[in-house]
């Protein structure tokens, strides 16, 4: 297992609709054809997996159908979008990148992006 540098923004404020997008960039030492990207969430010292996708270079990322993540890739960059976020989901979202094929296997883990989520103000009651 070889180490690889992964860069991601330090902090992102989610939209009022609970959507946050950020780029995860990795310094690929070789010509990987198969890449796995995992998003981990760290909050109060607990780390949980948010979503993961394996893709072939040049192809779209495919997350599971019920995943809150979507993404696209371009070269050594992965543009990740996480939706359905609420204030309680605020936390550090860490991008983990694995170059699966061809060997050697490379692993890189970013410093994390603090995603801050604000629940929208409730709409005032309407008359209809």
């Amino acid at each position: 297992c070889k180490a690889m540098h992964v860069a991601q923004p330090a902090v992102v404020l989610a939209s009022s609709r609970g959507i946050a997008s950020f780029v995860c960039e990795y310094a690929s030492p070789g010509k990987a054809t198969e890449v796995r990207v995992t998003v981990l969430r760290q909050a109060d010292s607990q780390v949980t997996e948010v979503c993961a996708a394996t893709y072939m270079m040049g192809n779209e990322l495919t997350f599971l159908d019920d995943s809150i993540c979507t993404g696209t890739s371009s070269g050594n960059q992965v543009n990740l979008t996480i939706q359905g976020l609420r204030a309680m989901d605020t936390g550090l979202y860490i991008c983990k990148v694995e170059l699966m094929y061809p060997p050697p296997y490379y692993l890189g883990i970013g410093n994390g992006t603090q995603i801050y989520v604000i629940d929208p103000e409730p709409c005032p009651d309407s008359d209809f």
Epitope: V12, L13, D44, T113
Partner: antibody, heavy 118, light 108 residues
Framework: QVQLVQSGAEVKKPGASVKVSCKAS????????ISWVRQAPGQGLEWMGW????????NYAQKLQGRVTMTTDTSTSTAYMELRSLRSDDTAVYFC???????????WGQGTLVTVSS | EIVLTQSPGTLSLSPGERATLSCRAS???????LAWYQQKPGQAPRLLIY???SRATGIPDRFSGSGSGTDFTLTISRLEPEDFAVYYC?????????FGQGTKVEIK
């Protein structure tokens, strides 16, 4: 090293607007956020809001909603805070601060005194 | 809005003494999102503690933070002459982010 340099002192009349700038250097500007905090003479710190330089999304204090606008210019690594319809109780020192990975404000500008007086 | 109440308002102590500053929140605050700042007259605040107990870069180890839920404490183990200042707690876990009203640590 990280530095935040703010624009100079301003004197404004009630009802006018003021725009304070905060030029950042020493780090990747659009990877972080900028928060604005003000301090009236002899008083404590009041949080005004913050902007994510990464995507331009903002979060304002309810009290100032509608009067304040925070923006960034990533080409010059500068953040701006505009406050409209100024009143005498807006007289304060206005600080910008970097919002980092842990969200606390590790780096601050030197402050800009805004005086609102007729 | 989470209201932070600091006590005491003023603390009169001598250099070398221990200072204990309290910050009480009106609702529970995630300990990941509580900070302490020091401010001297005419200067910008300086971050001392973030995440309730993590010391910021370059902060001497005589400063320590503790607490969880609604009760947080900043302790200065042995006051140095340069520690006499105003101290603020801040929560940034729930919008709007808020500051306490401050505790002034003055020379007795």
């Amino acid at each position: 090293q990280v530095q935040l340099v703010q624009s100079g002192a301003e004197v404004k009349k009630p009802g006018a607007s003021v725009k304070v700038s905060c030029k950042a250097s020493g780090y990747t500007f659009n990877s972080y956020g900028i928060s604005w905090v003000r301090q009236a003479p002899g008083q404590g710190l009041e949080w005004m809001g913050w902007i994510s330089a990464y995507n331009g999304n903002t979060n304002y204090a309810q009290k100032l909603q509608g009067r304040v606008t925070m923006t960034t210019d990533t080409s010059t690594s500068t953040a701006y805070m505009e406050l409209r319809s100024l009143r005498s109780d807006d007289t304060a020192v206005y600080f910008c601060a970097r919002v980092g990975r842990h969200l606390a404000f590790a780096y601050w500008g030197q402050g800009t005194l805004v005086t609102v007086s007729s | 809005e989470i209201v932070l109440t600091q006590s005491p308002g003023t603390l009169s102590l001598s250099p070398g003494e221990r200072a204990t500053l309290s910050c009480r929140a009106s609702q529970s605050v995630s300990s990941s999102y509580l900070a302490w700042y020091q401010q001297k007259p005419g200067q910008a605040p300086r971050l001392l503690i973030y995440g309730a107990s993590s010391r910021a870069t370059g902060i001497p180890d005589r400063f320590s933070g503790s607490g969880s839920g609604t009760d947080f404490t900043l302790t200065i183990s042995r006051l140095e002459p340069e520690d006499f200042a105003v101290y603020y707690c801040q929560q940034y876990g729930s919008s709007p982010w808020t500051f306490g009203q401050g505790t002034k640590v003055e020379i007795k």
